[in-house]
Amino acid sequence: KESCDVQLYIKRQSYHSIFAGDPFKLECPVKYCAHRPQVTWCKLNGTTCVKLEGRHTSWKQEKNLSFFILHFEPVLPSDNGSYRCSANFLSAIIESHSTTLYVTDVKSASERPSKDEMASRPWLLYS
């Protein structure tokens, strides 16, 4: 029997290497059964996750999963950091793992590094 708990499918310690000035969509895959829960995004500030208010968000529906999307239009250097989505379901809060955005400011990068170059940076390796 399939569990009817809400589940948020963000991988633990996942990250995205993105560039300032580009558009970016941060997706929170949500599995639910009958009623779609209310989902929000927050940004980590130390141990506190600050709810993101007034941001452009949307839903995308696929076969077995819905995606709650946070839109960056465009990405700003200040968007660097860790984000978490959470769902309000039957008066309980279900929190996802956090996912980290590493923003490269194109003004300070002579050319866009490859994925392997991104991975070779110590601040990526040990974050």
Epitope: Y9, K11, R12, S14, H16, S17, K115, D116, A119
Partner: antibody
Framework: QVQLVQSGAEVKKPGSSVKVSCKAS????????MYWVRQAPGQGLEWIGR????????RYAQKFQGRATITADESTSTAYMELSSLRSEDTAVYYC????????????WGQGTLVTVSS | DIQMTQSPSSLSASVGDRVTITCRSS???????????LNWLQQKPGKAPKRLIY???KLDSGVPSRFSGSGSGTDFTLTISSLQPEDFATYYC?????????FGQGTKLEIK
């Protein structure tokens, strides 16, 4: 059930490279992390690095930075680990493993690939 | 890097014995989500390692209930309540909290 099958044993010359493959079945690798660990003869386990097959981002232990390259091909559910500038100390059994990226609910290892570096 | 130190490095015991292996990390394994990502592996000669326990105390499916894990912060233990012949192997702890992942040096469990 989740299974991993690795490529066969290799004998390599010092200074050359080796590329080991690891094919997963029973799981969508987009939902996992795949990682590589080695074990020199009679020694303990040493973590090399891991990849997120959903986006291709890899992370490495500092010791292997610049010498190891981990990649994944989602279409064939296969991960690869290439190690360059081989030396005799790289002689080891290389294991790939896969685990659930969301809840760590499974962790499965391949059978291992013996890489011998000898002139 | 986080150092993982296991003790003892080898241990002789008999079938039916209760055995405890300890693992100490050089810093706390408590992650920001409130969980400690500490795993225990079993490896038999010539075979690949197999995970027995994850998140300190959760048993992998198919692992006999005589195996248990406990601990928090920096100190963890693997206990086998009543040794069976198939339990003689090498056991490793390893941490999945921080990069790079690191392993203990192993504990070889031998028949007395």
């Amino acid at each position: 059930q989740v299974q991993l099958v690795q490529s066969g044993a290799e004998v390599k010359k010092p200074g050359s490279s080796v590329k080991v493959s690891c094919k997963a079945s029973g799981v969508n690798i987009k939902d996992t992390y795949m990682y590589w660990v080695r074990q020199a003869p009679g020694q303990g386990l040493e973590w090399i690095g891991r990849i997120d097959p959903a986006n291709g981002y890899a992370r490495y232990a500092q010791k292997f930075q610049g010498r190891a390259t981990i990649t994944a091909d989602e279409s064939t559910s296969t991960a690869y680990m290439e190690l360059s500038s081989l030396r005799s100390e790289d002689t080891a059994v290389y294991y790939c493993a896969v685990y659930d990226g969301y809840y760590e609910s499974f962790d499965v290892w391949g059978q291992g690939t013996l890489v011998t570096v000898s002139s | 890097d986080i150092q993982m130190t296991q003790s003892p490095s080898s241990l002789s015991a008999s079938v039916g014995d209760r055995v405890t292996i300890t693992c100490r990390s050089s810093q706390s394994l408590l992650d920001s989500d409130g969980k400690s990502y500490l795993n225990w592996l079993q490896q038999k000669p010539g075979k690949a390692p197999k995970r027995l326990i994850y998140l300190v105390s959760k048993l992998d499916s198919g692992v006999p209930s005589r195996f248990s894990g406990s601990g928090s912060g920096t100190d963890f233990t693997l206990t086998i309540s009543s040794l069976q012949p198939e339990d003689f192997a090498t056991y490793y702890c390893w941490q999945g909290t921080l990069f790079p992942r690191t392993f203990g040096q192993g504990t070889k469990l031998e028949i007395k």
